[in-house]
């Protein structure tokens, strides 16, 4: 019986530690996509509706803030699309890019952790165009560091929650 009690306590401890593991999955807020044809920062994301969730991390001023030191897996998926019903592309040659950036407040600095994308030729003869970028990587992050997303040509972003999102989850502590 004692062994069973110890076992269940161990399970509970494990479970509570898992529940405390920081994670975030943020989806684009389609009502507030910035304009611009160059690189712009995406600052409006959902954290508590649909697929979006956050735990033991903070979302503030368009940035995902780390609350616990650790090794994290970061990911971002960005979809670009254009349908002729919305008008014509002013240029058919496009650079469609995403940049995942880490900003440190303590030692003011900013680093691009990941970037992805391509130059595309989206011919005016086609009714519909679509392009998806997915980046992911394993990074050591410290409490207070902030993760943000920049993209080119935000007017072409696919606003669906299953198309444009980013997130992070802690994998292990820093030894």
């Amino acid at each position: 019986e004692k062994a069973m009690v110890d076992g269940s306590w161990l399970d509970l401890a494990k479970r509570s530690k898992l529940e405390a593991q920081p994670f975030a999955h943020l989806t684009i807020n389609a009502t507030d996509i910035p304009s611009g044809s160059h690189k712009v920062s995406l600052s409006s994301w959902y954290h508590d509706r649909g697929w979006a969730k956050i735990s033991n991390m903070t979302f503030s001023n368009g940035k995902l803030i780390v609350n616990q030191d650790g090794f994290y897996y970061l990911y971002a998926n960005i979809c670009f699309r254009h349908h002729e019903t919305s008008g014509d592309l002013a240029t058919e040659y496009l650079q469609l890019m995403v940049y995942v950036t880490k900003t440190s407040i303590k030692i003011p600095s900013s680093h691009t952790l990941m970037k992805g994308g391509s130059t595309k030729y989206w011919s005016g003869n086609s009714e519909f165009h679509f392009y998806s970028i997915n980046v992911g990587g394993f990074f050591k992050l410290r409490s207070g560091e902030e993760i943000s997303i920049e993209v080119s040509n935000p007017s072409l972003l696919d606003p669906d929650q299953d198309a444009t999102y980013f997130g992070a989850f802690k994998v292990r502590d820093i030894d």
């Epitope: 019903t85 008008g87 014509d88 592309l89 002013a90 007017s155």
Partner: antibody, heavy 126, light 103 residues
Framework: QVQLVQSGAEVRKPGASVKVSCKAS????????IHWVRQAPGQRLEWMGW????????KFSQKFQGRITVTRDTAASTAYMELRSLRSEDTAVYYC???????????????????WGQGTLVTVSS | EIVMTQSPSSLSASVGDRVTITCRAS??????LNWYQLKPGKAPRLLIY???SLQSGVPSRFSGSGSGAEFTLTISSLQPEDIATYYC?????FGQGTKVEIK
């Protein structure tokens, strides 16, 4: 205030060419596209083509492809539309119109024509 | 190619009347639909863009509604200066126009 001022009326013989100008003022010419639209007597408005005043890119209606040239002079903030091999059915009022999309803020030509020129009557008659 | 069809082609109404013009697209165009007013010898004027957004400077008696393939332009209280031909438009396609006259 934004203004588009077009050149005066023209009379041409069939087979000839006509070039209509559209001078823009009151905004940054290079940040917007200019469309050309015409209306023949008793007919609906008909879109002909556009030019991105910033980079000179153009797009034309299939109907006019090969007969139309649209150019711009950014220094003069002026767009030009030339139509060649004129026939009597080309008798119409030709309008230039500004696309409402600011190219500095995005890359989609939205086909919202927020400002128009006063129109240029082109008469094709032998 | 999308075709825009307006109805009626002409109408006659009294000052103060509520006037409705319909525009149908041959396929769904979401809300990408604009309305213009054309008076003889004058530059066309954008009234409504994106199906329901009122262009700045346009009187509030003009309103637009609809999405998909069916749209309407409404003049809530017809005024003498509203005598004109009205056109709906989606990108490269215009409707055939509706001529509005005063009874």
């Amino acid at each position: 205030q934004v203004q588009l001022v077009q050149s005066g009326a023209e009379v041409r013989k069939p087979g000839a060419s006509v070039k209509v100008s559209c001078k823009a003022s009151g905004y940054d010419f290079s940040n917007y596209a200019i469309h050309w639209v015409r209306q023949a007597p008793g007919q609906r408005l008909e879109w002909m083509g556009w030019i991105n005043a910033g980079n000179g890119n153009t797009k034309f209606s299939q109907k006019f492809q090969g007969r139309i040239t649209v150019t711009r002079d950014t220094a003069a903030s002026t767009a030009y539309m030339e139509l060649r091999s004129l026939r009597s059915e080309d008798t119409a009022v030709y309008y230039c119109a500004r696309d409402s999309s600011n190219m500095a803020r995005g890359i989609i030509i939205a086909y919202y024509f927020d400002y128009w020129g006063q129109g240029t009557l082109v008469t094709v008659s032998s | 190619e999308i075709v825009m069809t307006q109805s009626p082609s002409s109408l006659s109404a009294s000052v103060g009347d509520r006037v409705t013009i319909t525009c149908r697209a041959s396929q769904s165009i979401s809300r990408y639909l604009n309305w213009y007013q054309l008076k003889p010898g004058k530059a066309p004027r954008l009234l409504i863009y994106g199906a329901s957004s009122l262009q700045s400077g346009v009187p509030s008696r003009f309103s637009g509604s609809g999405s998909g393939a069916e749209f309407t332009l409404t003049i809530s209280s017809l005024q003498p200066e509203d005598i004109a031909t009205y056109y709906c438009q989606h990108t490269r396609a215009f409707g055939q126009g509706t001529k509005v006259e005063i009874k």
